[in-house]
């Protein structure tokens, strides 16, 4: 079942799940001048079954410009350079995530995908919160949240974090250095 | 929690226009496709067309084209349809909703007689 | 256009009993068809989206199948308060379009 609200806010503090529990949403957005086609879902659905999961349907972004056509516009060197680093950044990241029954890995970046990916998670999804740089974390438990139903309502648990002062940003599980991105993660990984 | 509030009814002479809103709480506006959805009793439910307020993109069924038009302020995270020209045949329930995950707003009830 | 036929106007079950609304879309649509509860006078309540998966807060009596061009909502243990008007929409091509809907009435 689809998680109601989105993880709690943390300030400082950005999230991403390791693996995406099936019936997880990621929805086809495109970055400023893009959109998606108007052929095929709206979103990518985690799919499958206890053995394999991978996303099912594909995003495709277009020039909002040139309208009813799937013509992809060639990046500006800029774009290049970044999208180069978030699929680096994502393969760096593949590797380090266990395969999970029921679960899919960090889908890869599409053309011309918007900065921030928009997850809509699942009952018995676990997000992992580390400070942004700059900020040092002060645990008082967990730093995860988890997505639970009680009472027929979902919530999501409260991260026991609090990100202060000036140091070296943590780190999430499986990942031996901090991420090169200014924020502590490539944007292609952080939701709402 | 998301919310999609309209307003319950219109009532409005044909041949002029109207424009029902939809403000949207709960959630990102600018990060989600917005619906228009029609509803007559004998003809189910129609996709008029949607918005994405992030980038002000719009997509239209064709067969609302010229009838229906789709705006959103952000400012106030409200979403509009105007339709114009009205006739009898346009009387019927409108309904705002967000494309995904599906939420959709109470509707407007929409009457048009002289 | 995608034309989305659901067959049975209406269906008339009993509390308890298990019942099952179609709907056959005119081409594939894959699984991206979505399932609406409308009761009078209120707005389409969201069910099933991807075929299958239930949104929250939907207990799990509902369940949604099917893939292609074929569609099933089976509602097992029927209650009163499942009486309502049940619609199907497919969103896998613009314009996205829905089923005529089908009534389930409790006798």
């Known amino acids: 079942e689809l998680c109601d609200d989105d993880p709690p806010k943390i300030t400082h503090a950005t999230f991403k799940a390791v693996a995406y529990k099936e019936g997880t949403m990621l929805n086809c957005e495109c970055k400023r001048g893009f959109r998606r086609i108007k052929s095929g879902s709206p979103y990518m659905l985690c799919t499958g079954n206890s053995s394999h999961s991978s996303w099912d349907n594909q995003c495709q972004c277009t020039s909002s410009a040139a309208r009813n056509t799937t013509k992809q516009v060639t990046p500006q060197p800029e774009e290049q350079k970044e999208r180069k680093t978030t699929e680096m950044q994502s393969q760096m990241q593949l590797a380090d995530q266990v395969s999970l029954p029921g679960h899919c890995r960090e889908p890869p970046p599409w053309e011309n995908e918007a900065t921030e990916r928009i997850y809509h998670f699942v009952v018995g999804q676990t997000v992992y919160y580390q400070c942004v740089q700059g900020y040092r974390a002060l645990h008082r438990g967990p730093a995860e949240s988890v997505c639970k139903m009680t009472h027929g309502k979902t919530r999501w648990t409260q991260p026991q974090l609090i990100c202060t002062g000036e140091t070296e940003p943590s780190q999430f599980p499986g990942e031996e250095e901090p991420q090169a991105s200014p924020d502590g993660l490539p944007e292609s990984e952080t939701s709402r | 929690q998301i919310q999609l509030q309209q307003p319950g009814a219109e009532l409005v002479r044909p041949g002029t226009s109207v424009k029902i809103s939809c403000k949207a709480s709960?959630?990102?506006?600018?990060?989600?496709?917005l619906g228009w959805v029609k509803q007559r009793p004998g003809h189910g439910l129609e996709w008029i067309g949607d918005?994405?307020?992030?980038?002000?993109?719009?997509n239209y069924n064709e067969k609302f084209k010229g009838k229906a038009t789709l705006t959103a302020d952000t400012s106030s995270s409200t979403a509009y349809m105007q339709l114009s020209s009205l006739t009898s045949e346009d009387s019927a329930v409108y309904f705002c909703?967000?494309?995904?995950?599906?939420?959709w707003g109470q509707g407007t009830s929409l009457t048009v007689s002289s | 256009d995608i034309v989305i036929t659901q067959s049975q106007k209406f269906m008339s079950t009993s509390v308890g009993d298990r019942v099952s609304v179609t709907c056959k879309a005119s081409?594939?649509?894959?699984?991206?068809v979505a399932w609406y509860q409308q009761k009078p006078g209120q707005s389409p309540k969201a069910l099933i989206y991807?075929?299958?998966y239930r949104y929250s807060g939907v207990p799990d009596r509902l369940t949604g199948s099917g893939s292609g061009t074929d569609f099933t909502l089976t509602i097992s243990n029927v209650q009163s308060e499942d009486l309502a008007e049940y619609f199907c929409?497919?969103?896998?091509?613009?314009?996205?379009?829905f089923g005529g809907g089908t009534k389930l009435e409790i006798k």
């Open positions: 909703a967000r494309v995904t995950p599906a939420s």
């Open positions: 709960g959630y990102t506006f600018t990060n989600y496709w």
């Open positions: 918005i994405y307020p992030g980038g002000g993109y719009t």
């Open positions: 081409q594939n649509v894959g699984t991206n």
């Open positions: 991807s075929a299958s």
């Open positions: 929409q497919q969103y896998n091509r613009y314009p996205y379009t």
